[in-house]
């Protein structure tokens, strides 16, 4: 659900951390309409997710930890 690199809505699916290689934060005050986490998957798809949802926060935390430990 994205247009010109902006997420316009959120996925209705839950993704597993093993499917995700990284993420980008989209901020509503930086040219896009909504806040979002854009997950980048192993299938080279970009998935727009709701940053308020617990499962999204969990994956962001996991990935952030991984980066810190590198």
């Amino acid at each position: 659900a994205s247009n010109f690199d902006c997420c316009l809505g959120y996925t209705d699916r839950i993704l597993h951390p093993k499917f995700i290689v990284g993420f980008t934060r989209q901020l509503a005050n930086e040219g896009c309409d909504i806040n979002a986490i854009i997950f980048h998957t192993k299938k080279k798809l970009s998935v727009c997710a709701n940053p308020k949802q617990t499962w999204v926060k969990y994956i962001v935390r996991l990935l952030s930890k991984k980066v810190k430990n590198m």
């Epitope: 993704l15 597993h16 499917f19 192993k42 949802q53 617990t54 499962w55």
Partner: antibody
Framework: QVQLVQSGAEVKKPGASVKVSCKAS????????MHWVRQAPGQGLEWMGL????????NYNQKFKGRVTLTVDTSTSTVYMELSSLRSEDTAVYYC?????????????WGQGTLVTVSS | DIQMTQSPSSLSASVGDRVTITCGAS??????LNWYQRKPGKAPKLLIY???NLADGVPSRFSGSGSGRDYTLTISSLQPEDFATYYC?????????FGQGTKLEIK
């Protein structure tokens, strides 16, 4: 110890709705998902959906096309599963089960099951 | 939706046998796979999570392996209490889907 206690067996007529409860104890209720899985006679396991008690987020199997609704009462650590427009194929044992991020999204504790019979 | 296919659908074996159950996914699920055991009249029990990790309290005769689309549950030496139905489950992406089950019976 972790316990999930479900409500008792139900007999319903086709077209009716059923609401099954699942009361959790022995762990921090808002830290884990609650899934619902069913097993019809002679069939395999089927995932119906989940609810996150911390933010009431729900995710449903579209196979049920809006017939299933999951709700939560955090004050009593209880999750409810309502299935509407019942048909004979909905006759099954319904389970609530805890979803755990820590075991790779596995379902690590299960309720005892609730038999729902749909019959005219 | 991701489809999960188990084989065989039923299996006869004896106490002490080594048994292997396979599970295939319709696409790569990157190890996001769990195994459950179900006995008649009882709730399912988590055996293996993340394709290879043994759940708490599960005997070490159970093991899981695999990657990509193909996964295996192995019981190294069957015990009388192991006769049950086994299910694999995809947790890569919702809807979470189960295999149709493998019923393990006494020969």
């Amino acid at each position: 110890q972790v316990q999930l206690v479900q409500s008792g067996a139900e007999v319903k007529k086709p077209g009716a709705s059923v609401k099954v409860s699942c009361k959790a104890s022995g762990y921090t209720f808002t830290s884990y998902w609650m899934h619902w899985v069913r097993q019809a006679p002679g069939q395999g396991l089927e995932w119906m959906g989940l609810i996150d008690p911390s933010d009431k987020y729900t995710n449903y199997n579209q196979k049920f096309k809006g017939r299933v609704t999951l709700t939560v009462d955090t004050s009593t650590s209880t999750v409810y599963m309502e299935l509407s427009s019942l048909r004979s194929e909905d006759t099954a044992v319904y389970y609530c089960t805890r979803g755990n991020y820590g075991v790779d999204y596995g379902m690590d504790y299960w309720g005892q099951g609730t038999l729902v019979t749909v019959s005219s | 939706d991701i489809q999960m296919t188990q084989s065989p659908s039923s299996l006869s074996a004896s106490v002490g046998d080594r048994v292997t159950i396979t599970c295939g996914a319709s696409e790569n699920i990157y190890g996001a796979l769990n195994w459950y055991q179900r006995k008649p009249g009882k709730a399912p029990k988590l055996l293996i999570y993340g394709a290879t990790n043994l759940a708490d309290g599960v005997p070490s005769r159970f093991s899981g392996s695999g990657s990509g689309r193909d996964y295996t549950l192995t019981i190294s030496s069957l015990q009388p209490e192991d006769f049950a139905t086994y299910y694999c489950q995809n947790v890569l992406i919702t809807p979470y889907t189960f295999g149709q089950g493998t019923k393990l019976e006494i020969k």
